[in-house]
Amino acid sequence: TRPHGSPGPLQCYSVGPLGILNCSWEPLGDLETPPVLYHQSQKYHPNRVWEVKVPSKQSWVTIPREQFTMADKLLIWGTQKGRPLWSSVSVNLETQMKPDTPQIFSQVDISEEATLEATVQWAPPVWPPQKVLICQFRYKECQAETWTRLEPQLKTDGLTPVEMQNLEPGTCYQVSGRCQVENGYPWGEWSSPLSFQTPFLDPEDVWVSGTVCETSGKRAALLVWKDPRPCVQVTYTVWFGAGDITTTQEEVPCCKSPVPAWMEWAVVSPGNSTSWVPPTNLSLVCLAPESAPCDVGVSSADGSPGIKVTWKQGTRKPLEYVVDWAQDGDSLDKLNWTRLPPGNLSTLLPGEFKGGVPYRITVTAVYSGGLAAAPSVWGFREELVPLAGPAVWRLPDDPPGTPVVAWGEVPRHQLRGQATHYTFCIQSRGLSTVCRNVSSQTQTATLPNLHLGSFKLWVTVSTVAGQGPPGPNLSLHLPDNRIRWK
């Protein structure tokens, strides 16, 4: 006799509230001769054997309820043309029950803790009644083929809700369940799936890049935010407002939007959001300079690739500080930023900062009523030798007959540090070169006592890492004062 619960050619279990017994087997080689099934009570009526005829070409049969007692154990076997078909099977009617499907309620609770999670309430099947069942649940994205089983399996004496974790925002999911009698066999059918949609996430962090508080009229600002789920393509709706005026930008791709002039607040929300949290609001009002942080300092952090930033509180305590930084020449959307609580007056900026690259670092105090930014500081992880020298040109003589020259600044990305000083060199034809250092604040030089003839002039700039190459030569001819560039 095959023990109950192990699959075999013949399987029997009770089904549904009427408690009929369903038996099925693998199709037989001879389909024309119908088999005959027999069952015998092993508990209550050991001497009674029932015969059940099977319609031809059918590989299952139901044994009517009136032929057996509910909690009995049955011995079941089959014959075809009088010959045994399979080993007999023992069926425990208390445990070999195929339960109905569990009921999954359509109210789905979604929360965003560390990840996006969905919780679903459920009820056990009506049948079998008063039995402790174990139920198993599974979920998948609506378009997916394969299901993910949820662990642990849940028992009907506790009715713990079904929890799905690490869900993607703005995605359709399906969940279904099935049950079996505890220590029994087999599993019930999977319930028809409940479909639900996770909401799109609001951006986690909204900030403004550029000159939102610029007073000179060159106000170019970009609202920027961090994508809560970079893998999911979401568009956003952005609202800007000032007084009674509100402007809306729809279908905005991630993660930037130009700030119209004179706007006082901005709100960003996922495009078709039915979000369960208020959208992210940022005040764009510029507060008085005394509210801004002061004495901002920047230095290369010892033994780390980061950059250290410190500051002092302005006249009042803000809600938080935002430190933002960008590489020289980067577009407004290439901004990085970090938020810090009001008690923090320093931070180590994370990331890999490249030597010789200038970074513009700004510390802003955020208040409920607006923003107050300290003047930006240009800092370096490490200074390098300049890549170029300044261009030199001639100014009007002062006094007449005494040449005056000026030179420009080397672009920040070629300077690769802060200028410590300039070196001004002059070379007369056939004579040695004379150089002298001048302050980094000086960009002109007067050339008294030059004899008649031709001269070449050039300037280098130095950072703490060393002296850069000469800039373009200026050819100078005395006394005719004509200038030719080499």
Epitope: D295, V296, S299, S300, Q418, H421, S439
Partner: nanobody, 123 residues
Framework: QVQLQESGGGSVQTGGSLRLSCAAS??????MAWFRQAPGKEREGVAA????????YYADSVKGRFTISQDNAKHTVDLQMNSLKPEDTAMYYC??????????????????WGQGTQVTVSS
Amino acid sequence: QVQLQESGGGSVQTGGSLRLSCAASGYSINRMAWFRQAPGKEREGVAAISIGGDRTYYADSVKGRFTISQDNAKHTVDLQMNSLKPEDTAMYYCAAGLVYGEAWLDSRHYNKWGQGTQVTVSS
């Protein structure tokens, strides 16, 4: 690697003068500063100078009495201390770093430090 060595400390009467010197070797610093620490007190900034010497900064307590200067040829930064007071008594440290912005006397930004030289002012 930057190495800093202070000299010039000593004992002096109130109203007297001392000149501290800090010799720097190595590269990649753009500011040097003097800090001091009296027994049982926190370290405080005294004066700072940018390499190139075109910017200086002083603590309010020493303005008008102390002067920081740089000798590019000798790679030294000097602190001339005049009109010394007993409250100037402390261990004086030279510090250097690659520092930007307005944190002139914030010790968190200076990552190279000398061993210190003692200054004692008696009344």
